[in-house]
Interface confidence: low
Amino acid sequence: DYKDDDDKLSTSKTIDMELVKRKRIEAIRGQILSKLRLASPPSQGEVPPGPLPEAVLALYNSTRDRVAGESAEPEPEPEADYYAKEVTRVLMVETHNEIYDKFKQSTHSIYMFFNTSELREAVPEPVLLSRAELRLLRLKLKVEQHVELYQKYSNNSWRYLSNRLLAPSDSPEWLSFDVTGVVRQWLSRGGEIEGFRLSAHCSCDSKDNTLQVDINGFTTGRRGDLATIHGMNRPFLLLMATPLERAQHLQSSRHRR
Amino acid sequence: DYKDDDDKLSTSKTIDMELVKRKRIEAIRGQILSKLRLASPPSQGEVPPGPLPEAVLALYNSTRDRVAGESAEPEPEPEADYYAKEVTRVLMVETHNEIYDKFKQSTHSIYMFFNTSELREAVPEPVLLSRAELRLLRLKLKVEQHVELYQKYSNNSWRYLSNRLLAPSDSPEWLSFDVTGVVRQWLSRGGEIEGFRLSAHCSCDSKDNTLQVDINGFTTGRRGDLATIHGMNRPFLLLMATPLERAQHLQSSRHRR
Amino acid sequence: ALDTNYCFSSTEKNCCVRQLYIDFRKDLGWKWIHEPKGYHANFCLGPCPYIWSLDTQYSKVLALYNQHNPGASAAPCCVPQALEPLPIVYYVGRKPKVEQLSNMIVRSCKCS
Amino acid sequence: ALDTNYCFSSTEKNCCVRQLYIDFRKDLGWKWIHEPKGYHANFCLGPCPYIWSLDTQYSKVLALYNQHNPGASAAPCCVPQALEPLPIVYYVGRKPKVEQLSNMIVRSCKCS
């Protein structure tokens, strides 16, 4: 609020820290409910007893943990991004699926396919998606590796998306690639299966283009048909989207102040 | 300043817009002088008559114009980046220089070398550099082209820096690559000539790796020894740095408030 | 967004970016800046109603929260959101200098 | 920077980020957020002296300007600079939901 007398511009009253804390706490109450578009806390009557399901905790932890390559949260777009985003994850189609048979074994690439019906179940409308990240658990790596991510395009061509320089490491580490635009495209199209390719960066005169990095969910030989899936830690898409009912509410209140 | 009575939190007095404007104008007077670390406006006694030199206007225009690939100004680091940065530019060594002879003609790359003594004259200490951009004037382009920028490393190896997807265009357009870290390295080392390479992106299974894009300052054939230099518009490094005298002032006042 | 597109074309009373052109010669009495002659500095002004008040209908409060107090501040304030730099040309003695001043132009505001 | 590293370890009277941990159950009386149990919300507090006043020694003003009124505001205000999101787990009926709330944690403040 504008303070319009000269005196206030340079002097400051004694601050009642407790009062400020209380006001901040009360404002946070409003902030959380308003971000969730809840008029009051949800009823807990139907909450099943016992701890949270493992899958929910895994999803919560995926969201909480900052991972390599993920940028700090960008300045949000004023309206839509103010509101809370529901977080879901869609696991990569398992590597014994026949879709992988179409792509020749290669020392420089691995392939990751996703079922778009699962994506649509999580995000019914492309416009609702606010962020999609491809997350890969990279196992230990002996040498620096420059990798590139591609999106599968029509007629088996591949479109370059982004690249990452991976430093050597003795411990596994999650990698994250922002694939929001791609997933939004997939949600708009009719395809059933869509995919990514992770490749070694090939320079025009370089000879050795082997993908050295091991990604959890593939055997070292990267033969799709022999791959072992290591639990929930195979590649997945982490999706952040406005729930449909919240979006409808937003649509109807599109007027300013 | 914290407003500690409830009343001020929800109500607002009538605003005297003229008073606010006056305060803002006075604050800007202080802001500009303080950013330049000037206690008062500089004397104009020695200023030569007549218009500004062409080179100065060109430099001013380079700074003023937003170019493709240049990000919006990042959130500044509180202290050092508050102060004004002197802007200078260092042009690429002309292509008839013998340094270019060492690099074989290639359809997929062009080379750009810079004289580090010129860089050091502009920025005496690596720590003074706050931003360095490589600027290239890209001529018209018929097809989409994916290009990569490399930095020359010791023993003629090249280190990947970044990439750009160039859309087809009928008109020339300036491209900008952030090369702050690289130029800081060069200023720290003893080398006389340092350089970049701009290459077509080569995918591991792609056959046609020709660099289609024309960069001003090179002939279409990209034969360095035959290159025609189009005036001031050949590739250059745009440098933003804290002037040495201002930095020394900063050093001596490193205490907090 | 409370940016120049919205604020300059509306009569918004609450927090918004306001037009302010500064002519170095006329407004600051300065002849030493050779380029530019002036610039659109703009500024942020307008209340960020606390909205934690009884007389506001609840559903309306909920909708307004993200504009008036999105950061859940104890005393929200109308401040710059997007800022742009300003390059200037001036002389030090006989030598012309081009310098870039960060965060000089206000493009949008927010309640924070 | 007026961040948690500096502000939490100093007795800075001027604009700084202040510690505030919110326990959902104790502070908000809420049992419906299952994870996390609380979070470090923090907040910005402290004056941003106007400093463009005649009684302040000029050279001192110059040195302080970038902290007290870097944006050359008509009334500088202590507001968040760096913010981080907060993921939460709660139930809607029998269904657990994970949602991410943007800009919930204040990491640093600035005079703006």
Epitope: E26, R29, L38, S40, P41 | - | W52, T56 | G29, K31
Partner: antibody
């Protein structure tokens, strides 16, 4: 202006049931949380329970077995169903609008009706 | 459930006096306390919520303070219309709403 008018009170025998109504006007009833509170003669206030806009209810532990709160948003009316009444249920029964800004202060009774007296006596 | 212990149960005071009524919660309840005034034959009237926030239209001689377990209602200068019974009330999600027993302020 805001008005809350309780009705349905009177004399009732122990063990019988009674339904109290609270007619609301002057505000958007379906948007508001509502409470029932009672006050035995010459004694203090006792909170019975609360109903949110969606029909979710909270009740005091002592009221859970015998008292039910409901609402009909189309009629702008709040109800309190009281079963198996006892002598100690004799009191003035108030309905009150909860101030429910941001889902918490709805248990602050912002506006009260004048009350209706229920006497449980044989 | 939380207990709210209000004291004193009654007090006598004169016009112009400063009057203080206290309320103690059996467990920490942050600042979730409201205060009401009730005159004979009338419903209660909200004075203060969130321990210290004055309801609009309530004279500024009424003030509230406290957080955690100890709360106070103060009338800085008692006026003739202030003779009434005052109740504190705790509120917290998922718990019952509890009123204090009341404090009757009478004319001395």
């Amino acid at each position: 202006q805001v008005q809350l008018v309780e009705s349905g009170g009177g004399v009732v025998q122990p063990g019988r049931s009674l339904r109290l109504s609270c007619a609301a006007s002057g505000f958007h009833f379906s948007n508001e949380a509502m409470n029932w509170i009672r006050q035995p003669p010459g004694k203090g206030l006792e909170w019975i329970g609360y109903i949110y806009t969606t029909g979710t209810t909270y009740r005091a532990n002592w009221a859970r077995g015998r008292f039910t709160i409901s609402r009909d948003n189309s009629k702008n009316t709040l109800y309190l169903q009281m079963n198996s009444l006892r002598a100690e249920d004799t009191a003035v029964y108030y309905c009150a609008r909860g101030w429910h800004i941001f889902g918490h202060h709805y248990w602050v009774m912002h506006f009260w009706g004048q009350g209706t007296l229920v006497t449980v006596s044989s | 459930d939380i207990q709210m212990t209000q004291s004193p149960s009654s007090l006598s005071a004169s016009v112009g006096d400063r009057v203080t009524i206290t309320c103690q919660a059996s467990q920490r309840i942050s600042t979730y306390v409201a205060w009401y005034q009730q005159k004979p034959g009338q419903p209660p009237k909200l004075l203060i919520y969130a321990a210290s926030t004055l309801e609009s239209g309530v004279p500024s001689r009424f003030s509230g303070s406290g957080s955690g377990t100890d709360f106070t209602l103060t009338i800085s200068s008692l006026q003739p219309e202030d003779f009434a019974t005052y109740y504190c009330q705790s509120y917290s999600d998922g718990d019952s709403v509890i009123f204090g027993q009341g404090t009757k302020v009478e004319i001395k």
